[in-house]
């Protein structure tokens, strides 16, 4: 049986990302130039190493985190290093034009690309709901609108809400998630007869998978303290980051087993699970005064992570199309929302004890900015769907969603790869 | 003890440029954000420049943005400001100053306070032809 | 950009009395407020952070309160090295900017 390939993308990819790329090219050649002050070369390498950190975080971490699919492993990996490529870029001139570009030029810093670095991250949070149904040139437009996003998301939450760098960025754990969901519920829903294998996973990539989850483990501390301004604010969060992950593997496990009839282990389960605890704790990492508080939330973190595994897939693969193996988008949104909910509660609490009588309305602008990173992310991500809805973009067709094949050059075009 | 020497003002034509320099000792130089700030004659205080322990982050006030850059080496425990484009309006004695940050253990969470802590004793500039 | 409003901008008090300085900011700056003394041809000096929390060495008769947009630095008996100019200070997380009060000259009666 011939194989029924999609429309070529050859003609639609290369021409929007290479002129998109020359773009981005002019805009760096007369908006910016490197911050030339530094005198210290120790401290620049030891300020680059958390960019490090989140690089290898998103490059590696969740590049193989989402490669767990049978028959879309190498797109998954290669497609988030594209992103990120591209969504370091823009976020770059994005967050030098609506922060410092009345001043003339955008001056690039190793904080700037940090910055760059964790927005790109958006996008490939986001990006696990649609992975599999979209081409390269989609997922351009994908990094575009959503960087955009949420450097505006983060913009307007700043100058509303007058928070620092950290607080705002710490939304993109709810933002990403909800963008992700609602791209997924506008694109192609079912999947037709015979299609069905290809969005299982299969073992090689599923230990793949599990290597993109135990880097993510391993750098969530400098992901949640990269951007906190002192040395006793990083040093809190990455030890409250540290405790909470931790819990959170040893619940994920437990708990996976705890929650199969036979008592066995699920991958897809664990996958997600063990990040749980860096999730929740990402608002709040900072504040969390104590190493039990933090594990507390760990273990909560990953039993609901568990149960949100076992029950939400069902739905999500119902209403948004959404394969059983893709958890980031609903277990980023449940944690998300926990992580918010952890914040607002530490305020209450510790308000109400020492008798101050801002508590209504602090607790009143943490709600807000909640809600307005959840509108933002649900608004611009319907407007991602409805623009990668158009016929321009060559979308795959259905029978061919979760196929490597599509994309990629094989010496040997076995059908069963 | 803990001290901050300012040095580098002088009497400068505008349009030139001058380089401050703050010597710190006796504490952990990398452990603390720092600033400048200005206070022109008979005048009160004008926040300048801030930079992060590390040297990751830098804010000017609008009155320099562009034309002061803040910076530190934080082998030799020295900050800088490089002052370039003087002008009149930037005739003042200029303080380094250490960004305190001190964290407050509440019941249920820490709260993170700033402040200025310690002051040199200043370095004039005087812009003038 | 946060203008912060410091009032009286002369404050005539005898020793021993109490004094009350008043700073008001144009929008809210939560508790990031902080009070500063400086004498003359002398650098500032750190008094007050998180608009109530006196810094290390200062004495007790020196108290800030506030919150919001409306701060108050209180000294209970005053000394005769309390006469100085007092500053008010906010930092404000976005944009990152920190701005002084143009600041209150506590003169003796």
């Known amino acids: 049986m011939s194989s029924k390939y999609p429309r070529s993308v050859r003609r639609c990819l290369p021409l929007w990302a290479l002129t998109l790329e020359a773009a981005l090219i002019l805009l760096f050649y007369f908006f910016t130039h490197y911050d030339a002050s530094l005198e210290d070369q120790k401290g620049l390498v030891a300020s680059y190493q958390v960019g490090q950190d989140l690089t290898v975080m998103a490059a590696i971490g969740l590049g193989f985190l989402t490669s767990s699919f049978r028959r879309h492993s190498w797109s998954s990996v290669a497609f988030n290093l594209f992103m990120l490529a591209l969504g370091v870029q823009w976020a770059i001139l994005l967050d030098g034009f609506l922060s410092q570009f009345p001043s003339g030029k955008v001056v690039i810093t190793l904080f700037s690309i940090r910055l760059a670095t964790m927005s790109a991250l958006s996008v490939l949070i986001s990006v696990d709901a649609v992975l599999g149904k979209v081409n390269l040139a989609q997922l351009v437009v994908m990094v575009l609108v959503e960087v955009t996003a949420l450097g505006n998301l983060r913009m307007v939450i700043s100058n509303i809400f007058n928070t620092d760098y950290h607080m705002n960025m710490m939304h993109i754990y709810v933002f990403a998630a909800y963008f992700g969901l609602s791209v997924a519920w506008c694109l192609p829903k079912p999947l037709p007869e015979g299609t069905e294998d290809k969005d299982q996973t299969a073992t090689i990539p599923s230990l793949s998978a599990m290597l993109g989850a135990l880097f993510l483990w391993m750098f969530w501390p400098s992901f949640n303290s990269a951007l906190l301004r002192s040395p006793i604010e990083r040093k809190n969060a990455v030890f409250n980051t540290y405790y909470a992950v931790a819990v959170s593997v040893v619940t994920a496990i437990s708990g996976s087993s705890l929650a199969h009839p036979q008592g066995k282990i699920s991958k897809t389960y664990v996958h997600s699970a063990v990040l749980a605890g860096g999730v929740a704790v990402g608002t709040s990492c900072h504040l969390i005064p104590s190493p039990w508080l933090a594990m507390v939330l760990g273990l909560v973190a990953g039993l609901i992570s568990v149960g949100g595994a076992k029950y939400l897939p069902g739905c999500c693969n119902r209403v948004l199309g959404i394969p059983h193996s893709s958890i980031m988008g609903y277990n980023f949104s449940l944690l998300g929302l926990l992580g918010e909910i952890i914040y607002i509660v530490l305020l209450v609490l510790d308000t109400v004890g020492a008798g101050n009588g801002m508590i209504g309305f602090q607790v009143l602008l943490s709600i807000g900015e909640l809600s307005l990173a959840i509108v933002i992310a649900l608004m611009s991500g319907l407007l991602t769907g409805l623009l990668l809805n158009l016929k321009i973009w060559k979308a795959p067709h259905e029978a061919k969603y979760f196929d490597d094949q599509v994309f990629w050059k094989f010496p040997h075009l076995a059908v069963g790869f | 003890q803990v001290q901050l020497v300012e040095s580098g003002g002088g009497v400068v034509q505008p349009g030139r440029s001058l380089r401050l320099s703050c010597a710190a000792s006796?504490?952990?130089?990398?452990?603390?954000?720092m600033h400048w700030v200005r206070q022109a004659p008979g005048k009160g205080l004008e926040w300048v420049a801030v930079?992060?322990?590390?040297?990751?982050?830098?804010y000017y006030a609008d009155s320099v943005k562009g034309r002061f850059t803040i910076s530190r080496d934080n082998s030799k425990n020295t900050l800088y400001l490089q002052m370039n484009s003087l002008r009149a309006e930037d005739t003042a004695v200029y303080y380094c100053?250490?960004?305190?940050?001190?964290?407050?253990?509440?019941?249920?969470?820490?709260?993170?306070?700033?402040?200025?802590?310690?002051w040199g004793k200043g370095t004039t500039v005087t812009v003038s032809s | 950009e946060i203008v912060m409003t410091q009032s009286p901008a002369t404050l005539s008090v005898s020793p021993g009395e109490r004094a009350t300085l008043s700073c008001r900011a144009s929008?809210?700056?939560?508790?990031?407020l902080a009070w500063y003394q400086q004498k003359p041809g002398q650098a500032p000096r750190l008094l007050i952070y998180?608009?109530?929390t006196r810094a290390t060495g200062i004495p007790a008769r020196f108290s800030g309160s506030g919150s919001g947009t409306e701060f108050t630095l209180t000294i209970s008996s005053l000394q005769s090295e309390d006469f100085a100019v007092y500053y008010c200070?906010?930092?404000?997380?976005?944009?990152?900017?920190?701005?002084f009060g143009q600041g209150t000259k506590l003169e003796i009666k």
């Open positions: 100053a250490r960004d305190m940050v001190t964290m407050v253990r509440g019941a249920y969470r820490n709260y993170y306070y700033y402040g200025m802590d310690v």
């Open positions: 006796g504490f952990t130089f990398s452990s603390y954000g």
């Open positions: 930079i992060w322990y590390d040297g990751s982050n830098k």
């Open positions: 929008q809210s700056v939560s508790s990031n």
């Open positions: 998180g608009a109530s």
């Open positions: 200070q906010q930092y404000n997380n976005w944009p990152t900017l920190y701005t």
